[in-house]
């Protein structure tokens, strides 16, 4: 079954290439778990960024080796994407699953257009 | 390749305990629910008892509950079945199988025979 | 605890022959339902998720339809692979719940 799924339309990633942003699910069950996907899509291909599966009211864990973390609140996951360049560019797109136990709900967002610019290197100094 | 491999069946006596395992690969075993699902001899499909992906959620069929305990170790990606007070209409093969929106995969099972 | 009823209980048919099973929950369970596919002395394969969505690696002569409470599984042409027991399985409202099954037999 569908489930909506709300994001933000643009962020702008930071100097160090990090970038937040909070995915939002209006869920129709009462799930005990919910795995959270980041999607990448650029030039029409789809990757998946990182992946995470949580209990209701517990924090989100990714593997140790993701660029993502985040933090969950009732039906709000705040996302966080680190290690970003300017050809990280792209719409990152949130997919929610409400896993068990039974009905099963899929849930996919718009997507979020992250921008990220690679900071100008700093101009040698001459004294 | 997602693979389910189940061990741990055997004879036991009616009032006996059996510990079932079942060791997964394949896939990110923490993400997705697991179930233990019989099939007496002859007979039809029964589902047993589930335990969601972090464990912090069990399920059980009336027919067992209070008796079987489901259990996981994330860590060693295995599922357990802890079956004490074993009666004879226990007596099945006894399948782990991977819960998405379906059963989408199964063990070969192993069989529990409860018989004096 | 939702109860799910097939029919029939078996059949025979020939290979070729159209086969069509039927599935029914004691209430609606919208399109959570799913099909399995057993052979004697192995583990179930699941066919079709989702009332209608085909497992990857399943051939196409399969197919699933129905929503609410009826639902269908046909075989379009039976091949001699085929010949199995089906089993229908709820999964839109826990415990998950099973069909009595339907044994597909050689004409």
């Known amino acids: 079954k569908a489930m909506h799924v709300a994001q933000p339309a643009v962020v702008l990633a930071s100097s160090r290439g990090i970038a937040s942003f909070v995915c939002e699910y209006a869920s129709p069950g009462k799930a005990t778990e919910v795995r959270v996907t980041v999607l990448r899509q650029a030039d029409s291909q789809v990757t998946e960024v990182c992946a995470a599966t949580y209990m209701m009211g517990n924090e989100l864990t990714f593997l140790d080796d993701s660029i993502c973390t985040g933090t969950s609140s009732g039906n709000q996951v705040n996302l966080t994407i680190q290690g970003l360049r300017a050809m990280d560019t792209g719409l990152y797109i949130c997919k929610v699953e409400l896993m068990y136990p039974p009905p099963y709900y899929l849930g996919i967002g718009n997507g979020t257009q992250i921008y990220v610019i690679d900071p100008e290197p700093c101009p040698d100094s001459d004294f | 390749e997602v693979q389910l491999l189940e061990s741990g069946g055997g004879l036991v006596q009616p009032g006996g305990s059996l510990r079932l395992s079942c060791a997964a690969s394949?896939?990110?075993?923490?993400?997705?629910?697991m179930s233990w699902v019989r099939q007496a001899p002859g007979k039809g499909l029964e589902w047993v008892s589930a335990?969601?992906?972090?464990?912090?959620?069990?399920y059980y069929a009336d027919s067992v509950k209070g008796r079987f305990t489901i259990s996981r170790d994330n860590s060693k990606n295995t599922l357990y079945l802890q079956m004490n007070s074993l009666r004879a209409e226990d007596t099945a093969v006894y399948y782990c199988?991977?819960?998405?929106?379906?059963?989408?995969?199964w063990g070969q099972g192993t069989l529990v025979t409860v018989s004096s | 605890d939702i109860q799910m009823t097939q029919s029939p209980s078996s059949l025979s048919a020939s290979v070729g022959d159209r086969v069509t099973i039927t599935c029914r929950a004691s209430?609606?369970?919208?399109?959570?339902l799913n099909w399995y596919q057993q052979k004697p002395g192995k583990a179930p394969k699941l066919l079709i998720y989702?009332?209608?969505s085909l497992q990857s690696g399943v051939p196409s002569r399969f197919s699933g339809s129905g929503s609410g409470t009826d639902f269908t599984l046909t075989i379009s042409s039976l091949q001699p692979e085929d010949f199995a027991t089906y089993y229908c399985?709820?999964?839109?409202?826990?415990?998950?719940?099973f069909g009595q099954g339907t044994k597909v037999e050689i004409k």
């Open positions: 199988a991977k819960r998405y929106i379906a059963f989408d995969y």
């Open positions: 394949g896939f990110t075993f923490s993400s997705y629910a």
């Open positions: 335990i969601s992906g972090s464990g912090g959620s069990t």
């Open positions: 209430q609606s369970i919208s399109s959570y």
């Open positions: 989702a009332a209608s």
């Open positions: 399985q709820q999964g839109g409202m826990p415990p998950d719940t």
